[in-house]
């Protein structure tokens, strides 16, 4: 019985289209078959849920249809993509992993990935 460690990159720069991707890796202390991954956003000590998905080990990660997140899983690694980001969404995005089944339950929380989002400059008017 050991605490679960979660690793994620410290900084990621979103693309000009407002898409940011990062890997969330966890060291599983148990033999979980059902895992829940949640992306949290921390701003001014307030924490909000961005998106969440539960998946069976060996299966694909499925977020809700209206989610701004997509992802794939491979072993103890989850590749997360957040889309539709704007400059105001710049902040710390925390990867939370929960081993839900079978018991015992385990919680793992990463240190967070600082995602920087820069809104693209509008194209200058052209005379041509």
């Amino acid at each position: 019985c050991k605490a679960m460690h979660v690793a994620q990159p410290a900084v990621v720069l979103a693309s000009s289209r407002g898409i940011a991707s990062f890997v969330c890796e966890y060291a599983s202390p148990g033999k979980a078959t059902e895992v829940r991954v949640t992306v949290l956003r921390q701003a001014d000590s307030q924490v909000t849920e961005v998106c969440a998905a539960t998946y069976m080990m060996g299966n694909e990660l499925t977020f809700l249809d209206d989610s701004i997140c997509t992802g794939t899983s491979s072993g103890n690694q989850v590749n997360l993509t957040i889309q539709g980001l704007r400059a105001m969404d710049t902040g710390l995005y925390i990867c939370k992993v929960e081993l839900m089944y079978p018991p015992p339950y385990y919680l793992g929380i990463g240190n967070g990935t600082q995602i920087y989002v820069i809104d693209p400059e509008p194209c200058p008017d052209s005379d041509f």
């Epitope: 605490a3 679960m4 949290l40 939370k96 839900m100 015992p104 339950y105 919680l107 929380i109």
Partner: antibody, heavy 118, light 107 residues
């Protein structure tokens, strides 16, 4: 205001049953896991049971496994604890608590007293 | 099951003094440790989570530190309303366990 309000406690004989309720308000109840924690008179806090936001996953302390059942109704913003085969050692104040997004129990109700005695 | 030990059971202080409480885990809980305050007849209140992060609305005289198995909770200057029982809790794995509590009373 974020609030949890327990009810349903009382005096029950050993072997009897009781159903506790916890009414939540001021937050999106369906987004949070919930727990029950108890405290015997003059003693410390003891975790009893937890349930995930959608009721898909449930966990119990060994001391209540097979006797207590946790459930929730997200449409009614309510959490429940069905307690069967009650024993004297189940006598305690029962608190419902919200499991915060970062893991700890961040919001607590005021508690409801359960006394098991003949 | 992870066992949490808090020592001593009771500490006596005067208002304005610095109080330092200890919590030790039987095995590593990483930083998945919280501190709660409980006053007589009241529900517990979350003060610290993640070993060192203050919960919303908690004054900065309360602080926490540590990771792994050894944790410390500090009240920099005791106010009259701080005299209470303080519990540590690990929430990294089930069963979630609490320490037996340390009572901070007035000298």
């Amino acid at each position: 205001e974020v609030q949890l309000l327990e009810s349903g406690g009382g005096l029950v004989q050993p072997g009897g049953s009781l159903r506790l309720s916890c009414a939540a308000s001021g937050f999106t109840f369906s987004s949070y896991a919930m727990s029950w924690v108890r405290q015997a008179p003059g003693k410390g806090l003891v975790w009893v049971s937890s349930i995930s936001s959608s009721s898909s996953y449930i966990y119990y302390a060994d001391s209540v496994k097979g006797r207590f059942t946790i459930s929730r109704d997200n449409a009614k913003n309510s959490l429940y604890l069905q307690m069967n085969s009650l024993r004297a050692e189940d006598t305690a104040v029962y608190y419902c608590a919200r499991v915060g997004l970062m893991g700890p129990f961040d919001i607590w109700g005021q508690g409801t007293m359960v006394t098991v005695s003949s | 099951e992870i066992v949490l030990t808090q020592s001593p059971a009771t500490l006596s202080f005067s208002p304005g003094e610095r109080a330092t409480l200890s919590c030790r885990a039987s095995q590593s809980v990483s930083s998945y440790l919280a501190w709660y305050q409980q006053k007589p007849g009241q529900a517990p209140r979350l003060l610290i989570y993640g070993a060192s992060s203050r919960a919303t609305g908690i004054p900065d005289r309360f602080s926490g530190s540590g990771s792994g198995t050894d944790f410390t909770f500090t009240i920099s200057r005791l106010e009259p309303e701080d005299f209470a029982v303080y519990y540590c809790q690990q929430y990294g794995s089930s069963p979630f366990t609490f320490g037996p509590g340390t009572k901070v009373d007035i000298k």
